[in-house]
Interface confidence: low
């Protein structure tokens, strides 16, 4: 009996109720490998999810996120709200980056500006909430009094990715 089931290709299941006949997967289900005794229910892309690839008898549906959200996790298992550049997502929604930090993407967290002085350089272009500083020649190459911006790295609030 086991041998008969192993002959069932992807897109079918081995139907015990019908003497191990290979039956096609019912609508909204799939089997991606041969020899399956059941077909898996297709993933439904609802709510903040939209369909990137329709389900077929041999492969599951693939989801994407609607506009204003981006995928996270295995196989886009969740959607996270986009923020603007210069912001990060907190429990209370999108918040501007603190002074001395920046975020040049719609996702992720605000990061400290580069500390130019660590590389013996000076700040050529000041940082903003959206952009990192641009480091230039070392202070020795500049006129006296030139300085570099070295703000401390901000403390991340307790909620920041606690897990």
């Amino acid at each position: 009996l086991q041998d008969l089931c192993s002959n069932c290709p992807a897109g079918t299941f081995c139907d015990n109720n019908r003497s191990q006949i290979c039956s096609p997967c019912p609508p909204n289900s799939f089997s991606s490998a041969g020899g399956q005794r059941t077909c898996d229910i297709c993933r439904q892309c609802k709510g903040v999810f939209k369909t990137r690839k329709e389900c077929s008898s041999t492969s599951n549906a693939e989801c994407d996120c609607i506009s204003g959200y981006h995928c996270l996790g295995a196989e886009c298992s969740m959607c996270e709200q986009d923020c603007k550049q210069g912001q990060e997502l907190t429990k209370k929604g999108c918040k501007d980056c603190c002074f001395g930090t920046f975020n040049d993407q719609k996702r992720g967290i605000c990061r400290p500006w580069t500390n130019c002085s660590l590389d013996g350089k000076s700040v050529l272009v000041n940082g903003t909430k959206e952009r990192d500083v641009v480091c230039g020649p070392s202070p020795a190459d500049l006129s006296p009094g030139a300085s570099s911006a070295t703000p401390p790295a901000p403390a991340r609030e307790p909620g920041h990715s606690p897990q």
């Epitope: 996270l72 969740m78 429990k91 996702r107 992720g108 991340r156 909620g159 990715s161 606690p162 897990q163």
Partner: antibody, heavy 121, light 107 residues
């Protein structure tokens, strides 16, 4: 596919520090937090701390602050947890697990198989 | 640290039965709660996040509810593969803290 590989077992003598490893593959290592969770035999789960590989930022459970040190080697996509001066209380299964960069509706989406640490002379 | 008190610590239930496990936090955790299932010798697996959201691929017989300090996990119709230990986890504040676990066995 995503994998977090941990050695199945480690044996260490009391007082001799030990470094547990967690090798990541199948994803961009620097973009996901690596967490460490302790489970003593027949007991519950305790969160030790986490590390963000991109900049090695760490959060620690105060209870483990003097016991565990979390580090990463980005070149080999490996996270490490060093336990100092181990005693029998440190004998446990240690799991590494990942969460993504920044998400409050957060889940541990992948786990290592766990390393069983035995502290014995 | 936030203390998570889980009950019962162990229970027996029959196949097809409705099962509910509860978790109480020592303070309001704003629904930042996950539920995990762990089988002997295996890594935990996340079932629910944000108190009531099902992780993709987890059977719909699992559901979560609650707010404030009180939360519950319900299995609408128990199946054999559901036996194991269930843990809740709060992630509203560092450090994240787990409940003590509920061992679910089949009658």
């Amino acid at each position: 596919q995503v994998q977090l590989q941990q050695p199945g077992a480690e044996l260490v003598r009391p007082g001799a520090s030990v470094k547990l490893s967690c090798k990541a593959s199948g994803y961009t290592f620097s973009s996901y937090w690596i967490n460490w969770v302790k489970q003593r035999p027949g007991q519950g789960l305790e969160w030790i701390g986490n590390i963000y590989p991109s900049d090695s930022y760490t959060n620690y459970n105060q209870k483990f602050k003097d016991k565990a040190t979390l580090t990463v080697d980005k070149s080999s996509s490996t996270a490490y947890m060093q336990l100092s001066s181990p005693t029998s209380d440190d004998s446990a299964v240690y799991y590494c697990t990942r969460t993504w960069e920044f998400y409050y509706d957060s889940v541990f989406d992948y786990w290592g198989q766990g390393t069983t640490l035995t502290v014995s002379s | 640290d936030i203390k998570m008190t889980q009950s019962p610590s162990s229970m027996y239930a029959s196949l097809g039965e409705r099962v509910t496990i509860t978790c109480k936090a020592s303070q309001d955790i704003n629904s930042y709660l996950s539920w995990f299932q762990q089988k002997p010798g295996k890594s935990p697996k996340t079932l629910i996040y944000r108190a009531n959201r099902l992780v993709d691929g987890v059977p719909s017989r699992f559901s979560g509810s609650g707010s404030g300090q009180d939360y519950s996990l319900t299995i609408s119709s128990l199946e054999y593969e559901d036996m194991g230990i269930y843990y809740c986890l709060q992630y509203d504040e560092l450090p994240p803290t787990f409940g003590g676990g509920t061992k679910l066995e089949i009658k």
